[in-house]
Interface confidence: medium
């Protein structure tokens, strides 16, 4: 039996490294985890503006610089449902990369780090 398409029940935005803090030249991986079937298209938003990238549940930021700093979220779109957006995650680029997460660096859900 074909499962009826349903809206995402929840979106988690996972970030590596933990806390979203990375040294210049490092790599950040953002993963949009969605519980929906069939899997919806996933787009990415930075500071309120969609990024001009092909839809993908994973956003890789290699060799990051300060221009990559900002607030990121992922948006799941499905033909039969409205978009659903994850809580935001803040990415910070620091010279040392050893600072703790900035206060309020992830959404209120507490998501934003890999379990």
């Amino acid at each position: 039996r074909v499962r009826e398409p349903g809206p995402p029940e929840g979106i988690q935005l996972l970030v590596e490294p933990e806390g979203g803090i990375v040294a210049p030249g490092g790599t950040v991986t953002l993963t949009c985890a969605i519980s929906a079937q069939p899997p919806p298209q996933v787009h990415w938003i930075k500071d309120g503006a969609p990024l001009p990238l092909a839809p993908s549940p994973v956003l890789l930021l290699p060799e990051v610089g300060h221009e990559d700093e900002g607030t990121y979220s992922c948006v799941a779109t499905h033909p039969s449902h409205g978009p659903q957006e994850s809580p935001p995650v803040s990415i910070r680029v620091t010279e040392t990369g050893d600072e703790g997460p900035a206060e309020g660096s992830v959404g209120e859900s507490g998501l934003g780090t890999l379990a």
Epitope: P83, P87, S109
Partner: nanobody
Framework: EVQLVESGGGLVQPGGSLRLSCAAS????????MGWYRQAPGKQLELVAL???????NYADFVRGRFTISRDTTKKTLYLQMNSLEPEDTAVYYC??????????WGQGTQVTVSS
């Protein structure tokens, strides 16, 4: 529970006009920046216009001078006045509450088709 409900879409000829509305409930509307986004078939989701909590409007280059975003805080409604519509404006238009209690909220979308 936050809800955003769009209306006002439809079929219009090139050069025509439409006014989209987005009614909000369950959120402190006057304190939330709001935006309109759109997605054409097979295309990327793209930002159309944003309006800040102070009422400052920002537009994508491809709609600047043709579209106007506004809000009525007493009615908790966001508007998008679309003039000089082009076939390339055909898309599903979504309104978005850009930040509310740590989460983002989207409407279900309204279809705009520009065709002769």
């Amino acid at each position: 529970e936050v809800q955003l409900v769009e209306s006002g879409g439809g079929l219009v000829q090139p050069g025509g006009s439409l006014r989209l509305s987005c009614a909000a409930s369950g959120t402190i509307f006057s304190l939330n920046p709001m935006g309109w986004y759109r997605q054409a078939p097979g295309k990327q989701l793209e930002l159309v216009a944003l309006i800040s909590d102070s009422g400052t409007a920002n537009y994508a280059d491809f709609v600047r001078g043709r579209f106007t975003i506004s809000r009525d805080t007493t009615k908790k409604t966001l508007y998008l006045q679309m003039n000089s519509l082009e076939p390339e404006d055909t898309a599903v238009y979504y309104c978005r509450s850009t930040f509310a209690a740590g989460n983002f909220y989207w409407g279900q979308g309204t279809q705009v088709t520009v065709s002769s």
